[in-house]
């Protein structure tokens, strides 16, 4: 796969994943409870990170936001923070990656700068995806823990049923948002990895010596010290640079102008 394709695909995959992270964060169905033993009507309760909703069999639906930070589970606050951090990093990652795309030319930005930006955006996407996956997993763990704890009823008051408070037995299920979050986090992570892989292709190769071609100039050409080093592409400032006045060029220049020179 070409560098441009890998970078472009990584960007698109990350973009889809990022959109999914935003969608999951905003969704109300992080957890659902089915009050199957309700004596009045079938009640379907579902919660998100920001509000809780109830839907009845009659069609009545009502949602209420958690307007206070106090009294909310610490885990919920942690999940909120992780998802927001994931979104913020994703936004920065997208902005950086737009400028890093090889198919987009911005001023005289060279491949070395684009490589650094691609790597930066890739790392940002990876962290963003990890934040989302951890956030969703923490919430899922909270639900599982809650399910087992809900069997322990809390009682207060004296005997009988007067003044008693107890936990209602409900079926806790993972909401759609959890699955969206897991998939989205995974996609963002994969996209970030692809961007990092693409970065390697964009970086000037420091290890392989590049072929240098000469053309007959009709004069004796003295070997210039440091010229071979320059021709191997060490350092971005020496890339695509004429080594001799008389005629050696790097392989890159040859590919750009294949008919310009006579080959020995």
């Amino acid at each position: 796969m070409s560098v441009t394709a890998c970078q472009g695909l990584g960007f698109v995959v990350s973009l889809i994943g990022f959109a999914g992270i935003i969608a999951a964060t905003c969704m109300d169905q992080w957890s659902t409870q089915d009050l199957y033993n309700n004596p009045v009507t079938a009640v379907f309760n579902y919660q998100g990170l920001w509000r809780s909703c109830v839907r009845e069999s009659s069609g009545f639906t009502e949602c209420r936001g958690y307007f206070t930070l106090l009294g909310l589970p610490a885990m919920l606050q942690a999940v909120r923070a992780l998802m927001i951090v994931g979104i913020v990093l994703g936004v920065i990652g997208i902005l950086v990656s737009i400028f890093a795309l090889k198919c987009i030319r911005i001023g005289s930005m060279d491949d070395s700068a684009k490589a650094k930006m691609t790597l930066t955006s890739g790392i940002l996407f990876i962290i963003s995806g990890i934040c989302a996956i951890i956030g969703v997993s923490v919430f899922a763990n909270m639900l599982v823990t809650n399910f087992w704890m809900s069997t322990a009823n809390m009682y207060s008051g004296m005997g009988g049923m007067g003044g008693m408070v107890q936990t209602v037995q409900t079926r806790y299920t993972f909401g759609a948002a959890l699955f969206v979050g897991w998939v989205a986090g995974g996609l963002t992570l994969i996209g970030g990895v692809m961007m990092c892989i693409a970065c390697r292709g964009l970086t000037p190769d420091d290890s392989n010596f590049k072929a240098v071609s000469y053309h007959a100039s009709g004069q004796n050409v003295a070997y210039r010290p440091g010229g071979f080093k320059a021709s191997t592409g060490f350092g971005s400032n020496t890339r695509n640079k004429k080594i001799y006045d008389g005629g050696a060029r790097t392989e890159d220049d040859e590919q750009s102008h294949p008919t310009k020179y006579d080959y020995v």
Epitope: V40, N45, V54, N146, V165, V168
Partner: nanobody
Framework: EVQVQESGGGLVQAGTSLRLSCAAS????????MGWYRQAPGKQRELVAG???????TYAHSVKERFTISRDNAKNTMYLQMNSLKSEDTAGYYC???????????????WGQGTLVTVSA
């Protein structure tokens, strides 16, 4: 902690009316279902009437035409209008509320201490 308190019980003549009230208080996020239960001496507890947040109601067969349940969601209050009372309606009437608690991410079922309704022949 969510609490519910009943009021309006007492001694009445058969054929008359009585209105019970149940008020919920405390750290309430949302009460979904509220209901009235009764328990006569030596008998099992039974649902008299229930009402959902959306206004769906249910009644025991024995009270269907005589009792009316209503609620005010804004005030977290429920009412039971009891007409044409009979001696068999004599019992302790208990308020029940199912409240969603965001602090624990669980439903809490809250019971009141009860109010006694005595119908004399």
């Amino acid at each position: 902690e969510v609490q519910v308190q009943e009021s309006g019980g007492g001694l009445v003549q058969a054929g008359t009316s009585l209105r019970l009230s149940c008020a919920a208080s405390g750290n309430i996020f949302r009460i979904d279902t509220m209901g009235w239960y009764r328990q006569a001496p030596g008998k099992q507890r039974e649902l008299v009437a229930g009402i959902s947040r959306g206004g769906t109601t249910t009644y025991a067969h024995s009270v269907k035409e005589r009792f009316t349940i209503s609620r005010d969601n804004a005030k977290n209050t429920m009412y039971l209008q009891m007409n044409s009372l009979k001696s068999e309606d004599t019992a302790g009437y208990y308020c029940n509320a199912q409240a969603w608690d965001p602090g624990t991410f669980r439903y809490l079922e809250v019971w009141g201490q009860g109010t006694l309704v005595t119908v004399s022949a």
